[in-house]
């Protein structure tokens, strides 16, 4: 694993445990939480950063309108079940034996239910939509320029292959990414989409997972993008499965 | 490691127009972004402009209309021109890295060069 | 622009004792959405060039010895040199980035 050898820190993830006993002395870091070794020459998924946080001591455009599928994460942190490979479980349930099935991002999908309840694959997040809102600016940031430096963003320091930025939209004071990544186009080695935005959507609210000064400094053309909301939605490849009565509450 | 280093004549005559040269090395021109800040003998940091790692520039308004920074990716090498200069733009002048999304702060500089106006 | 004003321009403190240097700028520098200010301080001593100390506003940079400390938010900051040391004696300057960048004025630190 690439963590810096000379002091022996794994620069894609602080909330890991490091130490200089892989082979031939190597760095080796190992997430909190579960204790998984990670790759920290990349994105650490989204399964054990979840699992590491609940372990932490606890501190002319037109926009697109998601899909009446589309789920948004209003359950919040638990503490997941993650599979050998660090992917979510498809089913998760908490300790009064509640029992639920989650996407790919581990978000819910389904009602909640008890221990019978069968879920029976890992339903892929294939298409997510982030919508930011920022603070005024003097004037509208440049669309291009916004355009560039976001998939710049997603590249360079996410790590995620420019084909799965579908696009960047933007209306004053509105912006919207859209990510995308079906399972077949999706490569061994390659990003995962949930976690790229994860790793985002920390960053955007100051919380970033990368060791080093801890902050996302965003600058379109030198001015800071200063993000006051965020909401994302996640499209999953089959459709989730909530009662009616939830769809009319 | 991350290294920098100013280089360029020492000597300008009024009128005429400074270049100075950042060499750098230990990171990617097209991943980081670099600083030019000068400072006059016994005076305080001004800063001059960036050259951003998207490539875009940003001047300090006093001096906007004089100035200009580009980069040479193949030459691993930023460049600052200063035109009309005075005696007032004698200074030492520094390159320093932009931490990219890290927070636009300084934790790289080169030593400096002197650079004297006079005729 | 935003302008940086240091106080006081020169300090002289005894070995040991707690120097305090201040830092206003002309608007807030407290990013909303993340809720850091983009202020930085720097350390540069005769010959050398600056040297980074804290970021945003209170995070001491990797290396640093703890007796240097930031505090402050929106417009008003303060850099401590809890117990002053021989080698700290050098100009201390504030830096915003909030809007491009500007330098405060520097303090010269000195030993009394």
């Known amino acids: 694993h690439t963590a810096a050898q000379d002091n022996c820190t794994c620069p894609t993830n602080k909330m890991t445990v490091c130490s200089p006993d892989g082979p031939g002395g190597r760095c080796q870091c190992r997430a909190l939480g579960s204790g998984m070794a990670v790759d920290c020459s990349t994105l650490t998924s989204k399964c054990l950063l979840l699992k590491a946080r609940m372990s932490a001591p606890k501190n002319a455009r037109t926009l697109v309108r998601p899909s009446e599928h589309a789920l948004v994460d209003n359950d919040g942190l638990y503490d997941p079940d993650c599979d050998p490979e660090g992917r979510f479980k498809a089913r998760q349930c908490n300790q009064t034996s509640v029992c639920w099935c989650v996407n790919s991002v581990g978000v819910r999908r389904t009602d909640k239910g008890d221990l019978s309840l069968r879920c029976d694959e890992l339903v892929r997040t294939h298409h997510i939509l982030i919508d930011l809102r920022h603070r005024p600016t003097a004037g509208a940031f440049n669309h291009s320029d916004l355009d560039a430096e976001l998939r710049r963003l997603f590249r360079e320091r996410y790590r995620l292959h420019p084909k799965f930025v579908a696009a960047v939209h933007y209306e004053q004071p509105t912006i919207q990414i859209e990510l995308r990544q079906n399972t077949s186009q999706k490569a061994a080695g390659d990003v995962d989409i949930g976690d790229a935005a994860y790793y985002f959507e920390r960053d955007i609210k100051g919380e970033s997972l990368f060791q080093g000064r801890g902050g996302l400094d965003l600058r379109v053309r030198g001015e800071p993008l200063q993000v006051e909301r965020t909401l994302i939605y996640y499209l999953d490849e089959i459709p989730p499965k909530f009662s009616m009565k939830r769809l009319t509450a | 490691q991350v290294q920098l280093q100013e280089s360029g004549p020492g000597l300008v005559k009024p009128s005429e127009t400074l270049s100075l040269t950042c060499t750098v090395s230990?990171?990617?021109?097209?991943?980081?972004?670099v600083n030019w800040i000068r400072q006059p003998p016994g005076k305080g940091l001004e800063w001059i402009g960036v050259m951003w790692a998207g490539g875009s520039t940003n001047y300090n308004s006093a001096l906007m209309s004089r100035v200009t920074i580009s980069k040479d990716t193949s030459k691993n090498q930023f460049s600052l021109k200063l035109s009309s200069v005075t005696a007032a733009d004698t200074a030492v002048y520094y390159c320093?890295?932009?931490?990219?999304?890290?927070?636009?702060?300084?934790?790289?500089w080169g030593q400096g060069t002197l650079v004297t106006v006079s005729s | 622009d935003i302008v940086m004003t240091q106080s006081p321009d020169s300090l002289a403190v005894s070995l040991g004792e707690r120097a305090t240097i201040n830092c206003k700028s002309s608007q807030s520098l407290l990013n909303s959405g993340t809720r850091k200010n983009y202020l930085a301080w720097y350390q540069q001593k005769p010959g050398q060039p600056p040297k980074l100390l804290i970021y945003w506003a209170s995070s001491r940079e990797s290396g640093v010895p703890d007796r240097f400390s930031g505090s402050g938010s929106g417009t008003d900051f303060t850099l401590t040199i809890s117990s002053l040391q021989a080698e700290d004696v050098a100009v201390y300057y504030c830096?915003?980035?909030?809007?491009?960048?500007?330098f405060g004025g520097g303090t010269k630190v000195e030993i009394k």
């Open positions: 320093a890295r932009d931490e990219n999304w890290d927070g636009a702060w300084f934790a790289y």
């Open positions: 230990g990171f990617s021109l097209t991943s980081y972004g």
């Open positions: 830096k915003q980035s909030y809007n491009l960048f500007t």
